[in-house]
């Protein structure tokens, strides 16, 4: 089902004695209580894995954590989508699967996490120090990314938490704008409620419905989502970019994704009924890029089968424009 | 409203080679990836392959390889399918079909394009 | 390759009456099957994706349902307009392929 952070519709107290003044100094402080408590940052996690059975076969796992509808996750290696990068599979929860050599086999494993078997021999397969990275596109929150890979001391059959290097683009400039935005916000709440327990209370006229209190959202935000922002550094190694890649067929995924079935409010059927998956160690790294949906409300100029925005499929190798995927 | 507009009939001689195209307006051309599918008369469909508008990008059908050859014109929006070393066997109607991410939906489709090959 | 069959290959109806169609996937492909419309001397539409998700505008007489290799396609009180062959096709990976279609036909 489809969650969003709503603002909740308040109902103050009828002014009394401090009129319209009154009535804003007590609206405003449950607004900001309501931005302050749902600010969490979603997080994506990514699994590097190395078959214990064929050296050269890789699962990559990942997942979001966050409040969010998915609606498109793109998963890459040789760096971020859009940097370099080059599409392994893209998986949209109702539109379907597509996938590229040498990924394999790629599927939902529940509502918000993904996993990816890559095999191949020679030039097309992956080894050891391979970055890979997933990308999640999600109604609020946006899209983000992530990127893991195995140490090259790995033992096969075990799983690596990927390195945590967060990926930032220019679209860091929006989230650092809004962090502000909520920071002044909740400095200025805690303001407001300190000069009100300075003052005497107003006597307000007895309402026939109580004051309703900010619901905050279903899933509390992690300590690492609301620690501070890392300097940003991505661990992008391409000594190990498949060698058939001029002449390999896959389509690169969109450099940026807002796709959302507008008809749409149920997720697929998937494998194993979305049955939960254990999320790995903190390692796994978590992203600070977030792509706003500037248009998420927008209809497109056409009717499309349940389509109201589609990004620009940047291919694997087309680099055009900064967020072109190579 | 979104338009994919095909070229009109052909007939070809077996061994000929035939160019068709698929024009696409009222969309991003490059949103969408262009799907090629072949209708035998009376017949099914099967899907011969997909081109990336973006990098030229392409996938092919098994069957298809070494027989199809898609190209893409961004500047006039345009797809094009050539069909080489022709035979009675790919005597049908041939449509353009546009699918939006991932790439595995044909979300419109053009009027179709009848081959006939025939000496 | 996932090989589609679908059943029947063709189907006498009038209009008014229910019918159903149905397509079994070589392997599980989850919930990721759509279902296609072509009337004679036209081009194919998309109906139905996902098993049941309606494309915008297809009436709610069409319903799909189905998971992993079975699936279905009901039309409910037949209308003039729903004559024509039906297709399914897998949406999960490439190459996309078909079933070999269902022709409904007023009886």
């Known amino acids: 089902m489809r969650t969003e952070a709503q603002v909740p519709a308040l109902q103050p107290p009828e002014p009394g004695l401090e009129g319209a003044m009154g009535h804003r100094t007590l609206v405003l402080p449950w607004v900001l209580l309501t931005l302050c408590v749902t600010a969490g940052t979603p997080e994506v996690w990514v699994q590097v894995r190395m078959e214990a059975t064929e050296l050269s076969s890789f699962t990559i796992r990942c997942g979001f954590l966050g409040s969010g509808s998915i609606s498109l996750v793109t998963v890459s290696w040789g760096g971020p989508n859009g940097a370099g990068g080059t599409t392994l599979a893209v998986l949209h929860p109702e539109r379907g699967i597509r996938q590229w050599a040498p990924a394999r086999q790629a599927r939902w494993e529940t509502q918000s996490s993904i996993s990816l078997i890559l095999e191949g021999s020679g030039a097309s397969s992956p080894c050891a120090n391979t970055t890979f990275c997933c990308k999640f596109a999600s109604f609020p929150e946006g899209s983000w990314e992530a990127c893991g890979s195995l140490p090259p001391s790995s033992d096969p059959g075990l799983s690596a938490p990927p390195t945590p290097a967060p990926i930032l683009r220019a679209d860091l400039a929006g989230i650092l704008g809004v962090s502000g935005v909520l920071l002044f916000g909740c400095v200025y709440l805690l303001h407001l409620l300190r000069r009100h327990k300075h003052r005497p209370a107003p006597r307000l006229q007895p309402s026939r419905t109580s004051p309703q209190a900010p619901r905050a959202r279903a899933w509390a935000p992690s300590q690492a989502s609301q620690a501070a922002l890392h300097v940003p550094y991505a661990t992008i190694n391409t000594s190990c970019r498949p060698a058939t890649l001029d002449t390999a067929h896959p389509h690169g995924g969109p450099s940026w994704w807002a796709s959302l079935p507008t008809h749409a409010a149920h997720r697929p059927q998937g494998p194993a009924a979305w049955a939960s998956t254990p999320i790995p160690a903190r390692g796994s790294f978590v992203s600070v890029e977030n792509g706003l949906y500037a248009q998420a409300g927008e209809r497109p100029p056409h009717t499309g089968p349940g389509l109201t925005l589609f990004p620009d499929p940047r291919g694997p190798r087309a680099m055009e424009g900064p967020l072109g995927v190579r | 409203e979104v338009q994919l507009q095909q070229s009109g009939p052909e007939l070809v001689k077996p061994g000929a080679s035939v160019k068709i195209s698929c024009k696409g307006s009222?969309?991003?051309?490059?949103?969408?990836?262009m799907n090629w599918v072949k209708q035998s008369h009376g017949k099914s469909l099967e899907w011969v392959g997909d081109i990336n508008p973006n990098n030229g990008d392409t996938t092919y059908s098994q069957k298809f390889m070494g027989k199809a050859t898609l190209t893409v014109d961004k500047s006039s929006s345009t797809a094009y399918m050539e069909l080489r070393s022709l035979t009675s066997e790919d005597s049908a109607v041939y449509h353009c079909a546009a699918s939006g991410p991932p790439y595995v939906l044909l979300d419109y489709w053009g009027q179709g394009t009848s081959v006939t090959v025939s000496s | 390759d996932i090989q589609m069959t679908q059943s029947p290959a063709s189907l006498s109806a009038s209009v008014g009456e229910t019918v159903t169609i149905t397509c079994r996937a070589s392997?599980?492909?989850?919930?990721?099957l759509a279902w296609y419309q072509q009337k004679q001397g036209k081009s194919p539409q998309l109906l139905v994706y996902n098993a049941k998700t309606l494309t915008e505008g297809v009436p709610t007489r069409f319903s799909g349902s189905g998971s992993g290799t079975q699936f279905s396609l009901k039309i409910d009180s037949l209308k003039p307009e729903d004559f024509g062959t039906y297709y399914c096709?897998?949406?999960?990976?490439?190459?996309?392929?078909f079933g070999a279609g269902t022709k409904l036909e007023l009886n």
């Open positions: 009222g969309y991003t051309f490059t949103d969408y990836f």
């Open positions: 392997e599980n492909i989850y919930s990721y």
């Open positions: 096709q897998h949406h999960y990976g490439t190459p996309l392929t």
